[in-house]
């Protein structure tokens, strides 16, 4: 069965850091562009960023609100995607989903909740 | 799975005569949403890849001579070559692309009598 499972969410103070993981199974992970998408409570979806495949240079791209604070990486040998979140702000509070594909996100995880609060 | 059955397996036709090849699908390939039959015909000559002749049962592909025509609907289809030319010697395949797994017929070998 194809699935993505996120972990690492939790409660953190403003200015703090958190590292999210997304473990993939049932798909050829190294062939997928991997994305992070977030959804603040009661709000819509916001693309956070992505990492391309090794064959596409493993380049990363980020949305403006997180650029410079968030970093996406991947470990193809472990079929795992990471999101390192630094200098967290209260407005980063959201459910964070990993989503895999080239362009359209045909595979999603169930999400992990990140709460930034003092 | 949809099974495609062609007949005859082979046929020999004189130059200038009509060649008729039949294809039956085990279930309908007519899509009610747009009234189109998802059936194609291909020609394959030795040492070459197949070449699309007909799509949607009766639409000739670009550059295909008008002596080739396709007809039929639902489960029964026909490819007609109205006036056989020497260069038409080949194997002809029907194919359904209505639903995976996409399936080809077994092929019909056309020779000159």
């Amino acid at each position: 069965e194809v699935q993505l499972v996120e972990s690492g969410g939790g409660l953190v103070k403003p200015g703090g850091s958190l590292r999210l993981s997304c473990a993939a199974s049932g798909l050829t992970f190294e062939r997928a562009w991997m994305n992070w998408v977030r959804q603040a409570p009661g709000k819509g979806l916001e693309w956070v960023g992505r990492i391309k495949r090794k064959t596409d240079g493993e380049t990363t791209d980020y949305a403006a609100p997180v650029k410079g604070r968030f970093s996406i990486s991947r470990d193809d040998s472990k079929n795992t995607l990471y999101l390192q979140m630094n200098s967290l702000k209260t407005e980063d509070t959201a459910v964070y989903y990993c989503a895999g594909s080239n362009r359209a996100f045909d595979i999603w995880g169930q999400g992990t909740m990140v709460t930034v609060s003092s | 799975d949809i099974v495609m059955t062609q007949s005859p397996d082979s046929l020999a036709v004189s130059l200038g005569e009509r060649a008729t090849i039949n294809c039956k699908s085990s279930q309908s390939v007519l899509y009610a949403g747009n009234n189109r039959n998802y059936l194609a015909w291909y020609q394959q000559k030795p040492g070459q890849p197949p070449k699309l002749l007909i799509n949607q049962a009766s639409t000739r592909a670009s550059g295909v001579p008008d002596r080739f025509s396709g007809s039929g609907s639902g489960t029964e289809f026909t490819l007609i070559i109205s006036s056989l030319q020497a260069e038409d010697v080949a194997i002809y395949y029907c194919q359904q692309y209505y639903t995976p797994p996409l399936a080809f017929g077994g092929g019909t070998k056309l020779e000159i009598k």
């Epitope: 994305n35 979806l45 791209d61 080239n102 362009r103 045909d106 | 194609a40 291909y42 799509n55």
Partner: antibody, heavy 121, light 111 residues
Framework: QIQLVQSGPELKKPGETVKISCKAS????????MNWVRQAPGKGLKWMGW????????THADDFKGRFAFSLETSARTAFLEINSLQNEDTATYFC??????????????WGAGTTVTVSS | DIVLTQSPASLAVSLGQRATISCKAS??????????MDWYQQKPGQPPKLLIY???NLESGIPARFSGSGSGTDFTLNIHPVEEEDAATYYC?????????FGGGTKLEIK
């Protein structure tokens, strides 16, 4: 010019792996599905499956699950077929063919010239 | 950034009727003949689910009552006939230009 250019013939031993490439030119690669078709010597055509070039999602026919992998190098407009644990019965010509990606999969209007794979000890 | 504006923000449709959701992009999301616009369905407590990719292509396993159309800057998702389980929030999403962006969502309720 619209074309699919396949890699050259391969001679392999049983148990080995082969990877065939199919490079597209003359059209938007991500607009079309890439299908793979096998033709054993003197036999008919058999659809192996296809890969959605937009999402990267592969679909395999039942007879081609397990040892057969479809992949993409989107930036190079290239599709790949990889066959693992080769068997003598994998000896065939393998064609890539351009198809569709919608609710209906579309006919194959552009074909590669084929790649002959011979498996022999 | 490409801004995607969905309308209406919410709509209520009777069972068996047609639901139409619009998505307008602030600039074209077409590239080389393709429209890089996708549609997702999200139900409460669940991740989004891909319905339509490249403007009009139905994702595998999605019922044919869902259809997408449009190009350039104007796109539409149609659901016909609407069924009970279609109650959800629908999002359009463009991947033509970074940053990839989503529409604000349209909440579909069944009358």
């Amino acid at each position: 010019q619209i074309q699919l250019v396949q890699s050259g013939p391969e001679l392999k031993k049983p148990g080995e792996t082969v990877k065939i490439s199919c490079k597209a030119s003359g059209f938007t690669f991500t607009n079309y599905g890439m299908n793979w078709v096998r033709q054993a010597p003197g036999k008919g055509l058999k659809w192996m499956g296809w890969i959605n070039t937009y999402t990267g999602q592969p679909t395999h026919a039942d007879d081609f699950k397990g040892r057969f992998a479809f992949s993409l190098e989107t930036s190079a407009r290239t599709a790949f077929l990889e066959i693992n644990s080769l068997q003598n019965e994998d000896t065939a010509t393998y064609f890539c063919a351009r198809g569709g990606m919608g609710v209906r999969l579309r006919y194959f209007d552009v074909w590669g010239a084929g790649t002959t794979v011979t498996v022999s000890s | 950034d490409i801004v995607l504006t969905q309308s209406p923000a919410s709509l209520a449709v009777s069972l068996g009727q047609r639901a139409t959701i619009s998505c307008k992009a602030s600039q074209s999301v077409d590239y080389d003949g393709d429209s890089y616009m996708d549609w997702y369905q999200q139900k409460p407590g669940q991740p989004p689910k891909l319905l339509i990719y490249a403007a009009s292509n139905l994702e595998s396993g999605i019922p044919a009552r869902f259809s997408g159309s449009g190009s350039g800057t104007d796109f539409t998702l149609n659901i016909h006939p609407v069924e009970e389980e279609d109650a959800a929030t629908y999002y359009c999403h463009q991947t033509n230009e970074d940053p990839w962006t989503f529409g604000g969502g349209t909440k579909l309720e069944i009358k």
